[in-house]
């Protein structure tokens, strides 16, 4: 957030900039942490929006028996490779098709043994808290299938009679690699030196990372009528003094008439 | 792009013989595999033999022994010497071809194809 300065007072504003605010002949510019016409207050909110989407590639080889392997095939941009692609693709849409989380695949390397296909299964699933279980979820789905079509779709008679035939011991799969997301480690990170009192919390399940000074959380600190600051002790409940009333106590809930204070001492006198 | 176009079909009696033959545009499946398909009325298509650049030929179970499937690279032309026909020989016959070394016979597996010729077998 930013305050516009005008006046004669902007020069010494400029070099009370805090925490590390930049002043740009206006206004003190803050850092994302920061707010206040000197950058001089917390924010109580940091936006750690999750992406839309959380992906997965699964690292998988296969050995095709249907076809032989010949040079030409290592040449990504050969007639031989890009039929090989079209049609080991289309049969992996098939094999897969049943999984609402995948995306497609994408060969890496084709060699000699029948043609052993060493390509990515990618995976992607919208981001929810739950995303890990549905992911490994759907991994696991991969497995069972591909082992069940490379073990059903094979050579008789030196013949295949499906799109691709598979040698059944040829399937492997390599390695497993999920998008880390961890909205509690973004959290911390992002809050700096105050990460300590930032926490996250969920609302229609997006998290929102907070301090106790953000309003309408469960974490929510209630200072009544005073403000909530924060501070490297942690948020502190600041107390107002109106008209009438001097508030104090740790969330501002003592209030202490003025009159009564004054009549108290006018007693003495 | 790659034209096929399938020729020699015809009518002929149980028994019988007929030499069907597929000219290619050019010789680019030399190095690949090429194939002879066939669709009879109301039925799926299915593979009938199959021949690779390795020199390798394969036959659906229903032809062994009658069909003998051969190219000519210098023609870039293929065939299918088909003996001893028979009724549920009569199909529409096409051929197909691959860049790959193909050891296929579904037709999910190719991707290049050449008009049919209608070969029907009665007496």
């Known amino acids: 957030r930013t305050t516009t300065c005008f006046g004669d007072g902007c020069q010494n504003t400029a070099s009370r900039c805090k925490n590390g605010g930049t002043w740009d002949g206006l206004k003190c510019q803050c850092p994302n942490l920061y707010y206040g016409e000197l950058c001089e207050e917390v924010v109580s909110s940091i936006d750690i929006g999750p992406p839309e989407t959380i992906s997965a590639q699964m690292e998988l080889t296969v050995t095709v028996t249907s076809v032989k392997f010949t040079e030409e095939l290592k040449n990504h941009s050969s007639q031989e490779f890009q039929e090989f692609k079209q049609t080991f693709t289309e049969q992996m849409n098939i094999v897969y098709s049943g999984i609402p989380e995948y995306v497609g695949v994408n060969i890496t390397k084709l060699r000699l043994g029948s043609v052993v296909v060493e390509h990515d299964v990618l995976l992607r699933t919208k981001y929810t808290p739950e995303y890990k279980t549905v992911l490994d979820n759907a991994t696991e789905v991969v497995k069972e299938k591909i082992t069940k079509v490379t073990t059903q779709q094979i050579m008789i008679n030196d013949i295949c009679s499906d799109m691709m035939c598979f040698n059944t011991t040829g399937t492997q799969v390599q390695n497993i690699t999920v998008t880390q997301y961890d909205p509690e480690e973004d959290c911390r990170k992002m809050a700096k030196e105050y990460g300590d009192y930032f926490v996250v919390e969920y609302r229609d399940q997006k998290p929102y990372c907070i301090s106790p000074c953000e309003p309408g959380f469960s974490v929510s600190k209630n200072c009544n009528l005073g403000k909530c600051q924060m501070s490297l002790s942690g948020p502190q409940c600041l107390c107002v003094t109106t008209e009438t009333h001097w508030y104090s106590g740790e969330t501002c809930n003592q209030g202490t008439q003025k009159s009564l204070v004054y009549g108290h001492h006018h007693h003495h006198h | 792009d790659v034209q096929l176009q399938a020729s020699g079909g015809g009518l002929v009696q149980p028994g019988g013989s007929l030499r069907l033959s597929c000219a290619a545009s050019d010789n680019t499946f030399s190095r690949g595999s090429m194939s002879w398909f066939r669709q009879a009325p109301g039925k799926e298509r299915e593979g009938v033999a199959i021949i690779s650049s390795d020199g390798w030929t394969g036959y659906a179970d229903s032809v062994k022994g009658r069909f003998t499937i051969s190219q000519d690279n210098a023609k870039n032309s293929l065939y299918l010497q088909m003996n001893s026909l028979r009724a549920e020989d009569t199909a529409v016959y096409y051929c197909?071809?691959?860049?790959?070394?193909?050891?296929?016979?579904?037709?999910?597996?190719?991707?290049?194809w050449g008009q049919g010729t209608m070969v029907t077998v009665s007496s």
């Open positions: 197909a071809a691959s860049f790959l070394v193909l050891r296929a016979l579904n037709p999910k597996a190719w991707h290049y």
